[in-house]
Each structure stands twice: as structure tokens, then as C-alpha cells.
């Protein structure tokens, strides 16, 4: 059967019928429904929501909808023994305590089970000591402190502002610096946009608002107790001492009201430069310790959270493909939230719900996609991408053989300025072509395409007339599919204007103020941006599942490989003498990239010309496209990061959210001038060039004519 025979709707109208069925009003209604109470992972409320979604997806018309449960390590505050931080005087008396909870937003005063702000997976402890302010706690911030300012964080409690990098990296850096505790806070410089009121009068963070979040360094492991394998009923679990990625020092987040009380007394060294100053009315002294009159006062942390093995539930819906049921296109986003999840994740979950409803409507009219579409509502994303990772571990053999693409669907918005897309280069042309067919929702772009407004507002730094598309990093549920399994992946959402809004994420991220009203009043009253994101995500899934030839262009991979090779070579060339001394050459990598470019070009020519009515040849060509991403996977993984196996892309070792290209080479070169054994260090650079060159060449050969 051709895909035309799989449907009773005219082929060219299939996509239009699907897109026309998506309604902003439905997304709004679903968002409201999903945000009235908290849906914290591992709670009864989130289990009930899973069952509700299962039931509704069945009603929408999916072929099957199942719950997949796992028993994973989660973390919760102690309900009777709250976490807080104190300033104590010389007698040990607490003269100031940080808040125990956020002031609840209007209308939510009587909601129970709002988890107070905490850093998930913090160990218990009550360290006390002098405070050191460490800016964003990035690698370079600790370099500045330790190497330039000669400030020793050993035995100190450090206070770091949120932003720039994933909080888990901050904690790891603090641990490596010898700190005995970490306080994380939201500075108005990063979470209070000028000219905007704080919630409930605007979308800015009030002083009592706090960002929750996990502080793990899992490096793609999933459940800390069962790395590599599903946390099922017969799982062997590691002891807590052997668990992957747990922090070893107490960590706690606070708002900027409490931060002001801690920071205003800081003494010691002045900030090294203006980039260390936030917007609070404090000196931003680095410390250690408090100034003159307050020098006998110390900071004490009181952390009593517990780690508990808890059951979580994914919802997995299936819409069977009519022609290639053994080829899977996956649309997945998480369901669990820290509190109400007004943006994260329910603005994404509401969009997924409407996409499922639209696909279901078409199916009820007799249509089926060519390939199978899997829909997923992941659990425990906020606790380390646990639901998606456990499911992928359980189904890894199927996924690596059958997985065509994964489209992520977390928050649909982080602003309302323009589109933001991160994806594999294989999807660039798909995204370009799709957005050219969609209407822009932006003011001033009436009657124009989404592609046009996106390109105007977020131009590519390399190619004029094209929009910016970023590398995939991590910090979301695509991680296991892309970084571990090598399944082509992408994500799309509406974002802010990064030029004018330099705060990190959106101000109310992971706070109690992330409510339905935040979205409905301030971000997207007409839900037109949500609808656009639904059209992009849904449109990508539709094309991936329904086009006869997979909408992947391998030539775009060739272009970026050259760009990434040039970039990593430039970094290495900052050390010309060492490259000469240790005979470091990038020739093999450039040669492999050249070969890839030529073979990809020839493959693309064959793709235009082959007989698409021959199902065997069609399947063969599609398999070469599907398996290209897989070909970049190194089964041995990256050094010390066995679950990051993609040789071209990995989450940055310094910021989980960011993607790094040729990460093996990049990490080998990082701070190489400080390595005690330069011969060994440059040897590792050479080894990583070898791995990268081999992998690119091997991937190229998968595109060669098969015989």
C-alpha cells in the first residue's frame, strides 16, 4: 500500500486537515484543566492526571494508550522539619531565617500540597560557616576566584546566583572547589525584566519567589539507582553511596528578598568586575564572611530532605502506521510539574493534548499515518528526565531499530517574541519548509509566514535570509533519544527577545507563580503563540510520519560538520607550539568531513532520482536516512560519560542546557594549559580527533551506495 491508499482524505489536504483541526481555544481549555492543582512527580495527583490523560487520549481515538510505571529515586522535603538557612550570631542564636514557603498567589491560598522551594536530591546536613559569593558558579567564575583572586572556597558555604548554566553544574563546581554547602538565589538582574511588574501584576519574579529544581549530575543516566537499565519490578538497585550523580553537599534555593539579607553583610574582597554585580542594593562583595560589625556572624543551613524510591507513570499512546507500522515517530513531553506548571510543562502538555485530538479526529475519519506515531506524557522530568529515560532504557532495542524521530514538547512558551528551534541538522530543511507554510502570529507580520517573522527577529549568524536554529543540548526529555540512542530529534517553542531581555529563562520559572493566569493574562491571552507551536510541533510529526521519503537532508549535516571542525581546529590552534611538539593534526577529521560532504551530495542526488514506487528501494533509502543519526553514536560513549554517546553533539560539561560540538575533542582541549601532564593531555586530544574522524567517516559510508 502507498500512503495514499492509507487514507480517504486527498493527500495534499492531509496536513491542512490536521493543522486546521488545531484550535487555540482547546489548548487554553486543556492548560486550565492541567494547572489547577500541583502535579509533582510521585504524588497521587500526578497519577490521577496520568489516568485522565490516558482516558482522554483513548477518547480522542488512539489505537492504544498504556501506563508505563517505574520505581525511581525521587527527593522531597521533610513535611515536619522544614529546610531553611539562618544567620547566626556568636552565641549560635538565629538572628535571621530564610522563608519557609513562597507567598501563595491570589486564588491559590487554600491549595494543599504545594511543595516548598527545595533543591531536589540535596543531602541532609546543617553546615555552618562563612559565606563566599561565587557569581553564577560557572567554571570560569571559580577560575576567577581561585586563580586570580586566590580565594579558597574550601570549608565555606557558597552563594551563587541562578542563571547562565544548569544548576547541577553550579553544585558540581562548588563541590570541586571544596565548599560545604551551596545557596542558590534568583537575582533581579537575571529574573526581573525592567519596566515589568512582579506577579500577580506582571510576569516578573517577586522577592519571595523561588526557583525549585534538581541538582543532579546524571550525565544521561536516568534513575540514579539503575543506570543503563529500567527501574522495573525486578531491578537491581545500587546503594545510595553508589548512586549516579547525587550531590555530596547540602544545597538550598532562596528568593532575592532572603538573598539581600545574606549578601548585604558580605565583606572580604570586592567583586572582581561589573559582571559579578547583580541588581540588588548590596556591594556584591565576594567574602569570605561578613563585614566588620557582623564578622562574628555565620551562615547555617538546615536541610532535612529525603531521597525515596517512588513510583512514576508515563502515558504512552499509539497511532499505528498504515504502511510502515514498525517505524516510530515520537512526540513526547512531560506532565510532572514543580507546582502548578503553568508554563513548565503544561503549556507543552496542552499542545500535545490538542495534537493528539487532531490526529484522533483524522483517524476517526478513516485516515492513518504512513508510520506509527507514539505520543508520550513523561513523568519525573523535573527529577532528572527519569520517566523518558527509563522508558527508553526499557525499549532501547526497539527504538534503535525503529526510531525515526523524536519531537520534544515541554513548555510551548518562554516568551512571546519569536520562534526558537533546536534540532538535528537533518531536520533543518523540514523546519524551514514547514514554517514557510505557516502563518506568523506576530504583530506586524499579518499575512506573512512564520518563517519570515522568525528570520527577521532571529536571524542565523552564518546564513543571511535564514533563521537561527540551535544545537540540541540537554535538560529535557529528548536527551536519551538523541544523545544516547542517536534518534534524530528536535524541539520548538516561542521565546523572548534575547537581545533586550538578558534574564535567564523566564522570571517565574519553577516558582509557585507559574500559574494558568500567568499565561492567560501576560504571555498569550489569545493562545495564538501556543497554536503556532502546536502547528510547528504537530506539523513536524505529521511530515515525519507521513511523507513517503523521510524529510531529512543529509547535506545540512555536511555543512555543520565542516563548521564544527573549523571551530574546534581554531580552539586547538590557540596552542600552536604544543600542536607542533605533540604532532597534533586535524587532517583526518577534515578529510572525513570532506568525504562525508561528497557522499552526502551523491546520496541526495540518488534520493531525487530513485523509483519511489519500488517499496524495497524506498525502504532502503529511508533506512539510510533514519540510521544516519544512529551512525554518529559511539557505543563506548564519551570519556566518563557513558550515556552521552553522540560524537558530534553532547551537553556541555560546563552547562547541561547547552550543546557542544565535537565534545570529546572540546573537553580534551579545555583548560589544557593547566594540565599537570601535557604529554598525556595532548595524547587525549589526538585520541579524540581519531574517534571523531573515524565516526564521521563511518557515518559517511552508511550513505554510500549499498552495493
Amino acid at each position: 500500500k502507498s500512503s495514499n491508499e492509507a487514507t480517504n482524505i486527498t493527500p495534499k489536504h492531509n496536513m491542512k486537515a490536521f493543522l486546521d483541526e488545531l484550535k487555540a481555544e482547546n489548548i487554553k481549555k486543556f492548560l486550565y484543566n492541567f494547572t489547577q492543582i500541583p502535579h509533582l512527580a510521585g504524588t497521587e495527583q500526578n497519577f490521577q492526571l496520568a489516568k485522565q490523560i490516558q482516558s482522554q487520549w483513548k477518547e480522542f481515538g488512539l489505537d492504544s494508550v498504556e501506563l508505563a510505571h517505574y520505581d525511581v529515586l525521587l527527593s522531597y522535603p521533610n513535611k515536619t522539619h522544614p529546610n531553611y538557612i539562618s544567620i547566626i550570631n556568636e552565641d549560635g542564636n538565629e538572628i535571621f531565617n530564610t522563608s519557609l514557603f513562597e507567598p501563595p498567589p491570589p486564588g491559590y491560598e487554600n491549595v494543599s500540597d504545594i511543595v516548598p522551594p527545595f533543591s531536589a536530591f540535596s543531602p541532609q546536613g546543617m553546615p555552618e560557616g562563612d559565606l563566599v559569593y561565587v557569581n553564577y558558579a560557572r567554571t570560569e567564575d571559580f577560575f576567577k576566584l581561585e586563580r586570580d583572586m586566590k580565594i579558597n572556597c574550601s570549608g565555606k558555604i557558597v552563594i551563587a546566583r541562578y542563571g547562565k548554566v544548569f544548576r547541577g553544574n553550579k553544585v558540581k563546581n562548588a563541590q570541586l572547589a571544596g565548599a560545604k554547602g551551596v545557596i542558590l538565589y534568583s537575582d533581579p538582574a537575571d529574573y526581573f525584566a525592567p519596566g515589568v511588574k512582579s506577579y500577580p501584576d506582571g510576569w516578573n519574579l517577586p522577592g519571595g519567589g523561588v526557583q525549585r529544581g534538581n541538582i543532579l549530575n546524571l550525565n544521561g543516566a536516568g534513575d540514579p539507582l539503575t543506570p543503563g537499565y529500567p527501574a522495573n519490578e525486578y531491578a537491581y538497585r545500587r546503594g545510595i553511596a553508589e548512586a549516579v550523580g547525587l550531590p555530596s553537599i547540602p544545597v538550598h534555593p532562596i528568593g532575592y528578598y532572603d538573598a539581600q539579607k545574606l549578601l548585604e553583610k558580605m565583606g572580604g574582597s570586592a567583586p572582581p568586575d561589573s559582571s559579578w554585580r547583580g541588581s540588588l542594593k548590596v556591594p556584591y562583595n565576594v567574602g569570605p564572611g561578613f563585614t566588620g560589625n557582623f564578622s562574628t556572624q555565620k551562615v547555617k543551613m538546615h536541610i532535612h530532605s529525603t531521597n525515596e524510591v517512588t513510583r512514576i507513570y508515563n502515558v504512552i499512546g499509539t497511532l499505528r502506521g498504515a504502511v510502515e507500522p514498525d517505524r516510530y515517530v515520537i512526540l513526547g513531553g512531560h506532565r510532572d510539574s514543580w507546582v502548578f506548571g503553568g508554563i513548565d510543562p503544561q503549556s507543552g502538555a496542552a499542545v500535545v493534548h490538542e495534537i493528539v485530538r487532531s490526529f484522533g479526529t483524522l483517524k476517526k475519519e478513516g485516515w492513518r499515518p504512513r508510520r506509527t506515531i507514539l505520543f508520550a506524557s513523561w513523568d519525573a522530568e523535573e527529577f532528572g528526565l527519569l520517566g523518558s529515560t527509563e522508558w527508553a532504557e526499557e525499549n532501547s532495542r526497539l527504538l534503535q531499530e525503529r526510531g525515526v524521530a523524536y519531537i520534544n514538547a515541554d513548555s510551548s512558551i518562554e516568551g512571546n517574541y519569536t520562534l526558537r528551534v533546536d534540532c538535528t541538522p537533518l531536520m533543518y530543511s523540514l523546519v524551514h519548509n514547514l514554517t514557510k507554510e505557516l502563518k506568523s502570529p506576530d504583530e506586524g507580520f499579518e499575512g506573512k509566514s512564520l518563517y519570515e517573522s522568525w528570520t527577521k527577529k532571529s536571524p542565523s549568524p552564518e546564513f543571511s535570509g535564514m533563521p537561527r536554529i540551535s544545537k540540541l543540548g540537554s535538560g529535557n526529555d529528548f536527551e536519551v533519544f538523541f544523545q544516547r540512542l542517536g534518534i534524530a530529534s528536535g524541539r520548538a517553542r516561542y521565546t523572548k527577545n534575547w537581545e533586550t531581555n538578558k534574564f535567564s529563562g523566564y522570571p517565574l520559572y519553577h516558582s509557585v507563580y507559574e500559574t494558568y493566569e500567568l499565561v492567560e493574562k501576560f504571555y498569550d491571552p489569545m493562545f495564538k503563540y501556543h497554536l503556532t507551536v502546536a502547528q510547528v510541533r504537530g506539523g513536524m510529526v505529521f511530515e515525519l510520519a507521513n511523507s513517503i521519503v523521510l524529510p531529512f537532508d543529509c547535506r545540512d549535516y555536511a555543512v555543520v560538520l565542516r563548521k564544527y571542525a573549523d571551530k574546534i581546529y581554531s580552539i586547538s590552534m590557540k596552542h600552536p607550539q604544543e600542536m607542533k611538539t605533540y604532532s597534533v593534526s586535524f587532517d583526518s577529521l577534515f578529510s572525513a568531513v570532506k568525504n562525508f560532504t561528497e557522499i552526502a551530495s551523491k546520496f541526495s542526488e540518488r534520493l531525487q532520482d530513485f523509483d519511489k514506487s519500488n517499496p524495497i528501494v524506498l525502504r532502503m533509502m529511508n533506512d539510510q536516512l533514519m540510521f544516519l543519526e544512529r551512525a554518529f553514536i559511539d557505543p563506548l560513549g564519551l570519556p566518563d560519560r557513558p550515556f552521552y554517546r553522540h560524537v558530534i553533539y553532547a551537553p556541555s560539561s560546563h552547562n547541561k542546557y547547552a550543546g557542544e560540538s565535537f565534545p570529546g575533542i572540546y573537553d580534551a582541549l579545555f583548560d589544557i594549559e593547566s594540565k599537570v601532564d601535557p604529554s598525556k593531555a595532548w595524547g587525549e586530544v589526538k585520541r579524540q580527533i581519531y574517534v571523531a574522524a573515524f565516526t564521521v567517516q563511518a557515518a559517511a559510508e552508511t550513505l554510500s551506495e549499498v552495493a
Epitope: 535571621f96 519557609l100 507567598p103 519571595g208
Partner: antibody
Framework: QVQLVESGGGVVQPGRSLRLSCAAS????????MHWVRQAPGKGLEWVAF????????HQADSVKGRFTISRDNSKNTLYLQMNSLRAEDTAVYFC?????????????????WGQGTLVTVSS | DIQMTQSPSSLSASVGDSVTITCRAS??????LNWYQQKPGKAPKLLIY???SLLSGVPSRFSGSGSGTDFTLTISGLHPEDFATYFC??????????FGQGTRLDIK
């Protein structure tokens, strides 16, 4: 508009107790810290006590420590001051006041709205 | 505790005059200084916070300045309703909050 109404004042003998209340309206009471400030007849202002919105911080002036206790009931939008072991020098008009602090554009330990006060006279 | 000293304790002025009241802290309080106005038998009203920020609704003839230990409240062109007692208050090192002893502004 913001309103703070104190009650519970009166004449009391030294050593006895009194409980002052302050009913709040016109703002989200549970989001703000609250203060008690007193003013002896013909004198200046003296801060008495503070309670944070979530009760994580309760502070009293040294002059009343161990005798006066500040508390709040967010469900009733009411602030309290329990005054025990009263002394003649506690005679004053007692004001409840709202802390201004909510966000970056406001300041803490800044009293932006005050009630009209309730007179406490400690006399034998 | 931080002591706050206001000067003068009292002053007389006429409608239309400009007057300045000063407040000195016993140690640096950065700009954590507030000014209040109180009329007889009434509650105090906040005028200025963090040394120079005018509370919404307060007439622009009121202004504040200073940082560290020395602060001033200036009323440029007195109106009849401005005759009252003015208090400064520090919010830097708390608890305790401490007030100045007050400055009484009378009609000349």
C-alpha cells in the same frame, strides 16, 4: 485600598496582660511582613516587633523581649500582639504597620501603611 | 544598635519656604533610610524610602538624598498641609528598626 484597624487597647494594671489585634484588608495580607510600632504620649516612634509573612522570622525589641509575642493568622487576615507582664513604660499608642517589601522595586523594613493606633495605658 | 539623630528637633517656616531636615546614622547604612510624616493624633505616613525613592502619591516637592551616614529630607515650597512632625528610620541593620527622635515643623 489598604486598611489596618487595631483593637484591644485599654487600661490595664501593671503585671497584667493584653492582646492587641490588627485586622487587615485591601491587600494580600499573607504576602507581607507586619510590624508593631508604639508611641508613648508626646514622644517619638519605637519599633516593637516584626513577623514575616510565613512566620519564619519573629523579632522583638529588647525592651519587650520575653514579654511580648507577635503572631498572625493569615486565614483571618489578622495580626496579633500578646503583651504580658505589662509595665508603666509600655503605655503608648500601638500602631500596626505593613512592610512595603514585595519585590525588587520596594524596600524591606519599610512601613508603607499604618493603622490609626490603639491606646494602651498601664496604670495601677 | 544603630542610633539615628535628627536635626533640628524643631523648626519654624512659612508657606512657600523650602526647608531641609537632616538625619545622621551612627554607622553607615548605605541608602537604607526612610522618611515619615506624622500629624497630631494620626498615624505616620511613609514619604520616601531607600533615601530618595518617592512613594507613589507623595507630592514631588518632597525629596530625599544622602548615602552612608548623612541624609536629608527637603521640602521645596511648603504647603499648609506639610506642617507636621517628620521621622527618619534606618532599615539597614535590623532588628531593631530604629527611628530618629523626630523634627517638628511649625508655621512661623
Amino acid at each position: 485600598q489598604v486598611q489596618l484597624v487595631e483593637s484591644g487597647g485599654g487600661v490595664v494594671q501593671p503585671g497584667r496582660s493584653l492582646r492587641l489585634s490588627c485586622a487587615a484588608s485591601g491587600f494580600t495580607f499573607r504576602s507581607y511582613g507586619m510590624h508593631w510600632v508604639r508611641q508613648a504620649p508626646g514622644k517619638g516612634l519605637e519599633w516593637v516587633a516584626f513577623i514575616s509573612y510565613d512566620e519564619s522570622n519573629k523579632h522583638q525589641a529588647d525592651s519587650v523581649k520575653g514579654r511580648f509575642t507577635i503572631s498572625r493568622d493569615n486565614s483571618k487576615n489578622t495580626l496579633y500582639l500578646q503583651m504580658n507582664s505589662l509595665r508603666a513604660e509600655d503605655t503608648a499608642v500601638y500602631f500596626c504597620a505593613k512592610d512595603q517589601y514585595y519585590d525588587f522595586l520596594t524596600a524591606y523594613d519599610t512601613l508603607d501603611y499604618w493603622g490609626q493606633g490603639t491606646l494602651v495605658t498601664v496604670s495601677s | 544598635d544603630i542610633q539615628m539623630t535628627q536635626s533640628p528637633s524643631s523648626l519654624s517656616a512659612s508657606v512657600g519656604d523650602s526647608v531641609t531636615i537632616t538625619c545622621r546614622a551612627s554607622q553607615s547604612i548605605n541608602n537604607y533610610l526612610n522618611w515619615y510624616q506624622q500629624k497630631p493624633g494620626k498615624a505616620p505616613k511613609l514619604l520616601i524610602y531607600t533615601a530618595s525613592s518617592l512613594l507613589s502619591g507623595v507630592p514631588s516637592r518632597f525629596s530625599g538624598s544622602g548615602s552612608g551616614t548623612d541624609f536629608t529630607l527637603t521640602i521645596s515650597g511648603l504647603h499648609p498641609e506639610d506642617f507636621a512632625t517628620y521621622f527618619c528610620q534606618q532599615s539597614f541593620s535590623t532588628p531593631p528598626i530604629t527611628f530618629g527622635q523626630g523634627t517638628r515643623l511649625d508655621i512661623k
